[in-house]
Interface confidence: medium
């Protein structure tokens, strides 16, 4: 590949040849370092950019502000990539969201978004969404009218209480609202009636803590 | 489906307090948001504030600051709303009222209403 | 704090199809969910439209929500009106700050 066009995402890494899922290096505009994520080369086409993924509890998800930003964890396993990169990549061009989720009796489903971006650190990382479809409930569980982020250390919810604090994690949260992907891990068995778990309301209800996460990004004209 | 069945009507003097219970079945009591919406005579729903009985948190609209307290009771899936200091325009129905998704400060079930009426 | 605005009343005939407006202050309709909630004399309210256009189970589908960005308002509309329609009729908001309803429109449908 040539020099001057390094990768901007997965789908550049894909159309370039790439098709096996895995750690790819990708230079995102406007950011001084080159980036490792997870390439999902599988899923519907391949050319998906993962932006978090949770699937055994081993990564600490209740963190500050600053982490959420510039992200955590190893792509090979669990992780947030960074809200300042997610900001970044969806500057680019325009993206669409998936969110691949699994319960622990082992059913999938999905939740796809036409449009996703995010604000900038000013704007506190607020969620762009248009057009939801999948097969997690026939609404959306995330907030399509749009969310700032908040952490435990930086209240920016529509609640009179501090959501990230109550529920954990970073999440775009409402009063509080219907997801949170970033909760507490929860084992089979007690993810039962649990507030701050790993949670997509309109696929499993309020209180089931999910046992796998996948959030990914790919371009709209991909 | 959630059912919430409030206390009955209550005549009370200016200046006194007033206790609204507020019982809750068929749902996580704890875990749902208790709001208390009061509707005056030719008036329209005023929000007084709400309770999440799982955290013992209330929240109150800044007309009732200091005047209204909302607890809850987890062990019998009560909330309460206590409004003190009556005056004549405090008359009105009372309701207390949750959502079927935690703590969204919208209301899908709502208590049959306690009038409370203020009179010398 | 911000204010929802509706109209102190509307009305129309049965069959036809009638829209009440929710105009938002200050802030930006978008940017919190609206509800719709139906209050007949001597009952308590019942949710008629949440989340701006969705309608709970057992609300007929003469009943929708919709947003308008641009008037910064929102809006319900009832079409096939039935006399069992008239009632009193409130929009509703929230924030960081709490819950706002709209004054109410008292809806009537004539004949």
């Known amino acids: 590949r040539e020099e001057e066009k390094p990768f901007r995402d997965c789908a550049d890494v894909y159309q370039a040849g790439f098709n096996k899922s895995g750690i790819y290096t990708i230079y995102i505009n406007n950011m001084p370092e080159p980036k490792k994520v997870f390439c999902n080369m599988d899923v519907n086409g391949g050319g998906w950019t993962v932006i978090q993924h949770r699937e055994d509890g081993s990564l600490d998800f209740q963190r500050g502000w600053k982490e959420y930003k510039m992200g955590f964890g190893n792509p090979s396993g669990e992780y947030w990539l960074g809200n300042e990169f997610i900001f970044a990549i969806t500057s680019q061009r325009q993206y669409m969201l998936r969110i691949e989720l699994m319960d622990w009796e082992g059913n999938r489903a999905y939740s796809q978004y036409d449009r996703f971006h995010i604000g900038n650190e000013k704007q506190n990382y607020r969620l762009y969404l248009k057009g939801h479809t999948g097969t997690a409930g026939k609404q959306s569980s995330l907030i399509l009218h749009g969310a700032d982020f908040s952490t435990k250390d930086a209240d920016n919810d529509n609640c009179m209480c501090k959501c990230a604090l109550m529920l954990t994690g970073g999440w775009w949260f409402d009063a509080c609202g219907p997801s949170n992907l970033n909760g507490m891990f929860y084992t089979a068995g007690q993810n039962h009636g649990k507030l701050n778990g790993i949670k997509w309301h309109y696929f499993k209800g309020p209180s089931y803590s999910l046992r796998s996460t996948t959030m990914m990004i790919r371009p709209l004209d991909f | 489906q959630v059912q919430l069945v409030q206390s009955g009507a209550e005549v009370k003097k200016p200046g006194s307090s007033v206790k609204v219970s507020c019982k809750a079945s068929g749902g996580t009591f704890s875990s749902h948001a208790i709001s208390w919406v009061r509707q005056a005579p030719g008036q329209g729903l005023e929000w007084m504030g709400r309770?999440?009985?799982?955290?013992?948190?209330?929240n109150y609209a800044q007309k009732f600051q200091g005047r209204v307290t909302i607890t809850a009771d987890e062990s019998t899936s009560t909330a309460y709303m206590e409004l003190s200091s009556l005056r004549s325009e405090d008359t009105a129905v009372y309701y207390c009222a949750t959502s079927r998704l935690e703590w969204l400060l919208y209301l899908d079930y709502w208590g049959q209403g306690t009038l409370v009426t203020v009179s010398s | 704090n911000f204010m929802l605005t509706q109209p102190h009343s509307v009305s129309e005939s049965p069959g036809k199809t009638v829209i009440i407006p929710c105009t938002r202050s200050s802030g930006s309709i978008a940017s919190n969910y609206v509800q719709w909630y139906q209050k007949r004399p001597g009952s308590a309210p019942s949710i008629v439209i949440y989340e701006d256009k969705q309608r709970p189970s057992g609300v007929p589908d003469r009943f929708s929500g919709s947003i308008d960005s641009s008037s910064n308002s929102a809006s319900l509309t009832i079409s096939g009106l039935k006399t069992e329609d008239e009632a009193d009729y409130y929009c509703q908001s929230y924030n960081s700050r709490g819950v706002m309803f709209g004054g109410g429109t008292k809806l009537t449908v004539l004949g």
């Open positions: 309770i999440i009985p799982i955290l013992g948190i209330a």
